[in-house]
């Protein structure tokens, strides 16, 4: 099944995808699409690159903010809404016969939660999930670097939520 990534409504979502250009600088076409990777290309394309640069974006909210020329084609979706939830396909279209690399990732967009944990738990939360659970006061997570995001799945989030609840923290869905 797909790796899941979580973002709050109004924040930026980061969906990692990368390849190693061989030789360095020898870029290949990449597409990002909403929906699992089909047999060919991407379905419902949101962003596409050619051998040089991004040449197609369906919205100004979709960006490649990593080092595209080194093969970091991670997708940033700005100001996410609940409608952005779902599976996304990153397809690296390596030339040749049936050489594509396909990566399906799942974005889970959650409503902002008001968390008022004990101070120690607040510190633990921030250090354990520096970019995953952000509140409006921190602003969009635009400064994240590839690889800095922990691979947090829903199970981990639910476990964290239960720990907060057990500690007496109040959690309210906005």
């Amino acid at each position: 099944s797909e790796v899941e990534y979580i973002a709050e409504v109004g924040q930026n979502a980061y969906l990692p995808c990368s390849y190693t250009p061989a030789p360095p600088g020898n870029l290949v076409p990449v597409c990002w699409g909403k929906g699992a990777c089909p047999v060919f290309d991407c379905s419902n394309v949101v962003l596409r690159t050619d051998n040089r640069d991004v040449n197609d974006r369906t919205s100004g909210r979709y960006w490649l903010k990593g080092d595209f020329h080194k093969g970091d084609v991670s997708l940033t979706i700005e100001n996410v809404t609940l409608a952005d939830s779902g599976v996304y396909c990153c397809r690296i279209q390596i030339p040749g016969i049936m050489n594509d690399e396909k990566h399906n990732v799942k974005l889970v967009v959650i409503k902002p939660a008001k968390v008022t944990p004990a101070p120690t738990l607040q510190r633990d939360l921030t250090s354990a999930f520096p970019r995953m659970l952000t509140t409006g006061e921190h602003g969009p997570a635009e400064t994240q670097t590839p690889g800095s995001l922990p691979d947090v799945n829903l199970t981990q989030i639910f476990t964290l939520t239960n720990e907060l609840r057990d500690s007496g923290a109040t959690i309210r869905t906005a």
């Epitope: 699992a36 089909p38 060919f40 379905s43 279209q93 030339p95 040749g96 049936m98 050489n99």
Partner: antibody, heavy 116, light 108 residues
Framework: EVQLLESGGGLVQPGGSLRLSCAAS????????MHWVRQAPGKGLEWVSA????????YYADSVKGRFTISRDNSKNTLYLQMNSLRAEDTAVYYC?????????WGQGTLVTVSS | EIVLTQSPGTLSLSPGERATLSCRAS???????LAWYQQKPGQAPRLLIY???SRATGIPDRFSGSGSGTDFTLTISRLEPEDFAVYYC?????????FGQGTKVEIK
């Protein structure tokens, strides 16, 4: 109006070769994936091969891999299928079709008969 | 590969009747990546439905598609004389592209 016109079919002996062409018009050829699909007499449809916009990526059914080669010339708006080491079971009408994963326009097909 | 099994093999109906064609996949078709085509004798196939339920350009609204997972249906709400043909389903969720064996809709 989108038009796809296949040519190059005919009678060929087992082990022989044939090159099919598909002339496209009415759309921006270089902006679309293209496919070959075949249909044996009285049978159903079988996907054969596909090629990406630029021609840099190609895909084949296991039944033709290593024997058939798909290519395109975007300057001539033409799709090709080079068929080598032909077998009796390759006998079919060969259609070229436009589209990525679903095929929204098809040519009328060209008949390839492999027989001694 | 995903095997698509269409049923019935032949459907004998009269003009004006409702036709229900089934396409069952050997494993789940991701994201409802399924298309339907119509083929008349001596003609090329014609795309009717993609994405399991989206009608292709120019297709009359008497044609509708539904389903997800492994079970998909093409419905022709009221058969017109020109609808008697062979219908194929095709999946594009898993390599390679595969087609069903077809359902023939014939005049009763």
């Amino acid at each position: 109006e989108v038009q796809l016109l296949e040519s190059g079919g005919g009678l060929v002996q087992p082990g022989g070769s044939l090159r099919l062409s598909c002339a496209a018009s009415g759309f921006t050829f270089s902006g679309y994936w293209m496919h070959w699909v075949r249909q044996a007499p009285g049978k159903g449809l079988e996907w054969v091969s596909a090629i990406s916009y630029s021609g840099s990526s190609t895909y084949y059914a296991d039944s033709v891999k290593g024997r058939f080669t798909i290519s395109r010339d975007n300057s001539k708006n033409t799709l090709y299928l080079q068929m080598n080491s032909l077998r009796a079971e390759d006998t079919a009408v060969y259609y070229c079709a436009k589209g990525t994963n679903w095929l929204d326009y098809w040519g009328q097909g060209t008949l390839v008969t492999v027989s001694s | 590969e995903i095997v698509l099994t269409q049923s019935p093999g032949t459907l004998s109906l009269s003009p004006g009747e409702r036709a229900t064609l089934s396409c069952r996949a050997s494993q789940s078709v991701s994201s409802s990546y399924l298309a339907w085509y119509q083929q008349k004798p001596g003609q090329a196939p014609r795309l009717l439905i993609y994405g399991a339920s989206s009608r292709a350009t120019g297709i009359p609204d008497r044609f509708s598609g539904s389903g997800s997972g492994t079970d998909f249906t093409l419905t022709i709400s009221r058969l017109e004389p020109e609808d008697f043909a062979v219908y194929y389903c095709q999946q594009y969720g898993s390599s390679p592209l595969t087609f069903g064996q077809g359902t023939k809709v014939e005049i009763k």
